[in-house]
């Protein structure tokens, strides 16, 4: 599903890839929300920004597929697929699979839901961030 | 208590155009599930034809096959599926059903919920 | 194209009897499948979902098992009551699957 290794991309492909995960994150959380009663847990830590935070690796893009593609077995909103496609055009292709167990009770399922796409829109706003700042500092 | 009510079915020519309605009652259109309309022709088993999601996306998902004829849309203000049916064929005749599905592995099956159907009839 | 092949397509047995039925994904579903009974004129009925989970009022005589792309549903004791015919389907949407159903299995009076 990789159609162009992620060195191809120039920065300004990454940052409107990064602005609509960005997008696709709120709309997830909005959904997530939804289900009331649920609260974020300290459980689960999804991982964002890399140590440079540099173009093209800003953000941890293998590992948030990963913590992604497990939130996809759990539930099919059909905009999870679309993050796992953003995801995938950020990826080399050589990156190595992140583990991540399911969890099995049915409410920890859900805060795992709740926390992961909360810290994914998080991460988005920051990565976003990074990059916007980053191209200010380069035109300077 | 969550009910599913289709509506719009009769008899129509072939080439004729339908516009089934799938009315909502006892909950309301928030987020986090699927409204998909089956099919099941005389004698014959359930079929799949199109779902939309109730949520941030009108997502919307057809069986190969229904593509291009068949169109789906809601009206959050009324509560109501649509499914529009263009250039009727006689194979088309079936019992139309609407159905809500959860999207989330983990709900519990209150989230499973189907109507009563409507019966379509094709023929000259 | 995805598909779920459920077999037999049909099936004669007596009350008492224990009855299995099979549901082969073409690629896997990670246990987004339900199992439905369906007399003639009603619509179905939720048996089985999330591939073991038994719904609500349906007697402990059915169960479900499986996962990735093989699933079973079975009746251990049949009942008179029974007689209809059973239908797998995946609600596992979006993605390359879809919503589909098996072909049915018709179970009737030996």
């Known amino acids: 599903s990789h159609t162009l290794p992620v060195h191809f991309l120039q920065p300004s492909d990454i940052q409107k890839i990064v602005e609509e995960l960005q997008s696709l994150s709120k709309m997830l959380l909005k959904d997530v929300k939804e289900d009331k009663g649920v609260l974020v847990s300290q459980n689960y830590t999804l991982p964002c920004l890399t140590p440079d935070a540099q173009p093209p690796n800003i953000i941890h893009s293998p590992a948030i597929r990963a913590y992604l593609k497990t939130i996809r077995q759990l539930d099919n909103k059909s905009v999870i697929d679309e993050i796992i496609e953003h995801l995938d055009k950020l990826i080399f292709q050589d990156a190595p699979e992140t583990n991540i167990s399911v969890p099995t009770d049915t409410h920890e399922c859900k805060r795992f839901i709740l926390t992961i796409s909360q810290q994914f829109s998080e991460c988005m706003d920051l990565a976003l961030k990074s990059l916007t700042s980053g191209a200010q500092q380069a035109t300077t | 208590q969550s009910q599913l009510v289709e509506s719009g079915g009769g008899s129509v020519q072939p080439g004729g155009s339908l516009r089934l309605s799938c009315a909502a009652s006892g909950f309301s259109f928030s987020a986090n599930y699927w409204i998909c309309w089956v099919r099941q022709a005389p004698g014959k088993g359930l079929e799949w034809i199109v779902c939309?999601?109730?949520?941030?996306?009108?997502?919307?998902y057809y069986a190969p096959w229904a593509k291009g004829r068949f169109t789906i849309s809601k009206d959050n203000s009324k509560n109501t599926v649509y499914l529009q049916m263009n250039s009727l064929r006689a194979e088309d005749t079936a019992t139309y059903f609407c159905a809500r599905f959860s999207s989330g592995i983990y709900d519990l099956d209150r989230f499973f919920l189907w109507g009563q159907g409507t019966q379509v009839t094709v023929s000259s | 194209a995805f598909q779920l092949t459920q077999s037999p397509s049909s099936l004669s047995a007596s009350v008492g009897d224990r009855v299995t039925i099979t549901c082969q994904a073409s690629q896997s579903i990670d246990s987004w499948l339900a199992w439905y009974q369906q007399k003639p004129g009603k619509p179905p009925k939720l048996l089985i979902y999330?591939?073991?989970k038994l719904a609500s009022g349906v007697p402990s005589r059915f169960s479900g098992s499986g996962s990735g792309t093989d699933y079973t549903l079975t009746i251990s004791s049949l009942q008179p009551e029974d007689f209809a015919t059973y239908y797998c389907q995946t609600y596992y949407g979006g993605g390359h699957i879809g919503w589909g159903f098996g072909t049915g299995t018709k179970v009737t009076v030996l």
């Open positions: 999330q591939a073991s």
């Open positions: 939309i999601y109730i949520g941030s996306r009108a997502d919307t």
